[in-house]
């Protein structure tokens, strides 16, 4: 018995179906095919779970969180024992193993391994200003999304004709911050943060209004 090499890793957007491949060759009839799909979740690597099983001509459900979402792609028994996972969740991310036995065909490689990564587009980021908005001050524009896999990068832009940040601004696209030093009236305006990753983008807006000093009355 020989389980074929798998593609190694599969990526899927959250909520979309995933197909985890596993095929094998055997010299025996499929009378006592035994297939066990297990997952080692990324979120709990020391707690492997059963996903779905086929034993003695019967199908068995795995862990309750997979109920109603998982099945074999074809009619069992077969040499293609790939499975689908519908409505993928972030918690489905992990390393999946198919263990195949088909007596009396023993020996060979009976395990196939496939990684599954469930991707999540950035959630609507939260924009805020840190620091005094008085003229001449330094301010930091903050942007962060609670969700996003892979981790989003953040791009700040000023919504004017140029879409460029003020010359005194420095941007950190990983942290999602923009530091604007020595703000002036020209620094005022609408700023947009664009959070993006491999499967999506999301934005938030922030209105920076630089406060000019009030003229003092001379008594």
């Amino acid at each position: 018995l020989e389980v074929s090499e798998s593609p190694g890793s599969i990526q899927v957007a959250r909520g979309q179906p995933a197909v985890l491949p596993c095929t094998f060759t055997t010299s025996a009839a499929l009378i006592n095919l035994n297939v066990i799909w297990m997952v080692t979740p990324l979120s709990n690597a020391n707690q492997p779970e059963q996903v779905i099983l086929y034993q003695g001509g019967q199908m068995f459900d795995g862990a309750p969180r997979f109920h109603g979402r998982v099945g074999f792609t074809g009619t069992m028994p077969a040499t293609n024992v790939s499975i689908f996972i519908n409505n993928t969740q972030l918690s489905d991310t992990g390393t999946y193993q198919c263990l195949v036995n088909n007596l009396p065909d023993i020996g060979g490689r009976n395990i196939g391994v496939t990684g599954l990564t469930v991707l999540v587009p950035p959630s609507a980021p939260h924009c805020q200003i840190q620091g005094s908005q008085d003229i001449g001050s330094d301010v930091i524009l903050l942007c962060s999304s609670e969700e996003g896999i892979p981790r989003p990068t953040y791009l700040w832009e000023k919504l004017d004709n140029t879409l460029k940040l003020p010359p005194t601004a420095t941007q950190d696209q990983v942290q999602g911050t923009v530091t604007i030093r020595n703000i002036s009236a020209l620094s005022s305006g609408l700023y947009q943060c664009v959070a993006s990753n491999a499967i999506g983008t999301s934005t938030c807006l922030l209105d920076l209004q630089v406060i000019s000093p009030q003229p003092r009355n001379i008594g």
Epitope: G56, Q58, F60, D61, P64, G68, G71, N110
Partner: antibody, heavy 126, light 107 residues
């Protein structure tokens, strides 16, 4: 204490119907496949039907296919067997049994009936 | 369907005796065989699974062996509570089938 208690047995005429129930307690019912097994008077055990934990997969013995329906309600920790078109040869003690998947060897599993109820008697007679 | 044939159908023995019950399958079932104990009015009990593995809580005087088509259940030293019916069952294929049973009686 892990327990299965069957109910609903009784005397019924040929062609009649009966619904058996099995109440589970002491374990996470929704995580296990469940089975009905019967024993006719003076005879051996006969597997009747099985249902997976989510009800996605259901199997029947040929002798009852098309007449019996297995179902479960995980919220109520209950297993059921609806028996229609009953025949004299369906007379038996009906047991519900939990299906347990047990590891052996390096990567092999076997299913076994690891917890049983005490049974309920079904008599089909005119 | 796989047919399991148990022998003997009944057997008389005394407390302290060593008893062996055999189960023969109509085709090879590897180690996919379980043994159960049945007592009247009580819930049946799983004794051994996968031909030779003792189920948790079952006394060590019970043992199982065999593979392929021939299997045995052995009780090394009979105790009063062991007088019951014993059944083998295969999980190699569907439908799951049982042997016809062996009734163990007090001599």
């Amino acid at each position: 204490e892990v327990q299965l208690v069957e109910s609903g047995g009784g005397l019924v005429k040929p062609g009649g119907s009966l619904r058996l129930s099995c109440a589970a307690s002491g374990f996470t019912f929704s995580s296990y496949s469940m089975n009905w097994v019967r024993q006719a008077p003076g005879k051996g055990l006969e597997w009747v039907s099985s249902i997976s934990s989510s009800s996605s997969y259901i199997y029947y013995a040929d002798s009852v296919k098309g007449r019996f329906t297995i179902s479960r309600d995980n919220a109520k920790n209950s297993l059921y067997l609806q028996m229609n078109s009953l025949r004299a040869e369906d007379t038996a003690v009906y047991y519900c049994a939990r299906g347990q998947l047990l590891w052996f060897g390096e990567s092999a599993l076997i299913d076994a009936f690891d917890i049983w109820g005490q049974g309920t008697m079904v008599t089909v007679s005119s | 369907e796989i047919v399991l044939t148990q022998s003997p159908s009944s057997l008389s023995a005394s407390v302290g005796d060593r008893v062996t019950i055999t189960c023969r399958a109509s085709q090879s079932i590897s180690s996919y065989l379980n043994w159960y104990q049945l007592k009247p009015g009580k819930a049946p009990k799983l004794l051994i699974y996968a031909a030779s593995i003792l189920q948790s809580g079952v006394p060590s005087r019970f043992s199982g062996s065999g593979s392929g088509t021939d299997f045995t259940l052995t009780i090394s030293s009979l105790q009063p509570e062991d007088f019951a019916a014993y059944y083998c069952q295969q999980s190699y294929s569907t439908p799951r089938t049982f042997g016809q049973g062996t009734k163990l009686e007090i001599k």
